[in-house]
């Protein structure tokens, strides 16, 4: 088992996932590709929690770059033992992974709440309302009710798709950070076993 390479793999994955989270969150601000709803403040309250931008995005880049840095070969070591420094680095990566868990957890929770509440839309009564808030998420199973939202166009599909993507991406980030916690603990305790001869591809 090569703990450094595993961490690097996780790091690169997290960068990609973080960028996707940021993109998904930004798209939530532009239902149907229009800017007017953001300027009129006619967006779901959970869009303003920046769960994809901050939680699953920026906050995830910190652990990602820490994990990527773990595989570098110029680790100075300590007490004359090269592996000791690498062990310290692996254990410190656990802290970074915990930050990642917090960020991805935040992203997952907000996305789940956003899905459960449904979008803010102009309902069949001509009011801006959380039309599906009282359905406890049941609206997700009954697409015939989605026409209750008259504006923005396709807002239910837009919200459901993007919050689902954030939920999935946040969930994957959470799992990867959890794996890195285990990887970091094992790497720190068992030692940094990668030799220059071993080549692992992600």
């Amino acid at each position: 088992m090569c703990y450094g390479k595993c961490a690097r793999c996780i790091g690169h994955s997290l960068v990609g996932l973080a960028l996707l989270c940021i993109a998904a969150n930004i798209l939530l601000y532009f239902p149907n590709g229009e800017t007017k709803y953001a300027s009129e403040n006619h967006l779901s309250r959970f869009v303003w929690f920046f769960s994809g931008i901050v939680g699953g995005g920026l906050l995830m880049l910190l652990p990602a770059f820490v994990f990527i840095g773990l595989e570098q070969d110029d680790c100075c070591g300590c007490c004359g033992h090269e592996n000791c420094g690498k062990r310290c680095a692996m254990l410190s990566s656990v802290l970074a992974a915990l930050i990642g868990i917090a960020g991805s957890g935040y992203c997952v929770i907000v996305a789940a709440l956003g899905l459960a509440e449904g979008p803010l839309c102009l309902d069949s009564l001509g009011q801006w309302n959380y039309t599906f808030a009282s359905t406890e998420g049941q609206y997700l199973l009954d697409t015939s009710t989605w026409s209750e939202c008259t504006e923005p166009k396709h807002i239910v599909e837009w919200n459901v798709s993007l919050f689902s993507i954030l939920l999935a991406l946040g969930g994957i980030e959470f799992i990867l950070c959890l794996i890195q916690v285990i990887n970091g603990v094992l790497g720190g305790i068992c030692g940094f076993c990668c030799s220059h001869q071993q080549q692992y591809d992600c």
């Epitope: 009564l125 001509g126 009011q127 801006w128 008259t150 504006e151 923005p152």
Partner: antibody, heavy 120, light 106 residues
């Protein structure tokens, strides 16, 4: 001046269709909804549904679902209401009405009305 | 469907008198709007949101009420006030109107 101008009176046979137009002027058409109401001779007012002029999404009253189609043409600021399978009890004055979205959703501007007579 | 019952169906009064029109909802609603209609004309908005006077409407018209019971009051009838008055709710679909109260000259 804010106004809604409707098309002229129509006489139709039972089973036929009628399409009433409603041209808006004096305001930004897509900022308000358009509601359709009818009034049979000597009777009260009956709501038929409304259309979101920005998205074109209509909401129909249950009594008219499947028989009515509401559309808009934003390029000419015109709303349309088509009623199919006409019966004699569809004889009424049909009004288009502007309303503002929000808490009270009141109907402040009314068209002059279009009399549709269904007779064999 | 929320049924609105207006009473009385006809109100016979003289100019200068006070008119009180009632609108009762079958179940509790958040607000009501009032309209005036004269023969051969489209209805005209008088009161919106239960108590707010529409633009260009004289101050002799006022609205009040909450829950199920709502009232339109004309403090002193003018000759042009003799017409049919409708209340309307849109707290839930379908939007409904009351049957109307005709205010006629005694």
């Amino acid at each position: 001046e804010v106004q809604l101008v409707q098309s002229g009176a129509e006489v139709k046979k039972p089973g036929a269709s009628v399409k009433v137009s409603c041209k808006a002027s004096g305001y930004t058409f897509t900022n308000y909804g358009v509601k359709w109401v009818r009034q049979a001779p000597g009777q009260g007012l009956e709501w038929m549904g409304w259309i979101n002029t920005y998205t074109g999404n209509p909401i129909y009253a249950a009594d008219f679902k499947g028989r009515v189609t509401m559309t808009t043409d934003t390029s000419t600021s015109t709303a349309y209401m088509e009623l199919r399978s006409l019966r004699s009890d569809d004889t009424a004055v049909y009004y288009c009405v502007r309303f503002q979205y929000g808490d009270y959703r009141y109907f402040d501007v009314w068209g002059q009305g279009t009399l549709v007579t269904v007779s064999s | 469907e929320i049924v609105l019952t207006q009473s009385p169906a006809t109100l016979s009064l003289s100019p200068g008198e006070r008119a009180t029109l009632s609108c009762r909802a079958q179940s509790g609603i958040s607000f009501i709007n009032w309209y005036q209609q004269k023969p051969g004309q489209a209805p005209r908005l008088l009161i919106y949101g239960t108590a707010n006077l529409a633009s260009g409407i004289p101050a002799r018209f006022s609205g009040s009420g909450s829950g199920r019971d709502f009232t339109l009051t004309i403090s002193s009838l003018e000759p042009e006030d003799f017409a049919v008055y409708y209340c309307q709710q849109w707290s839930s679909n379908p939007l409904t109107f009351g049957g109307g109260t005709k205010v006629e000259i005694k």
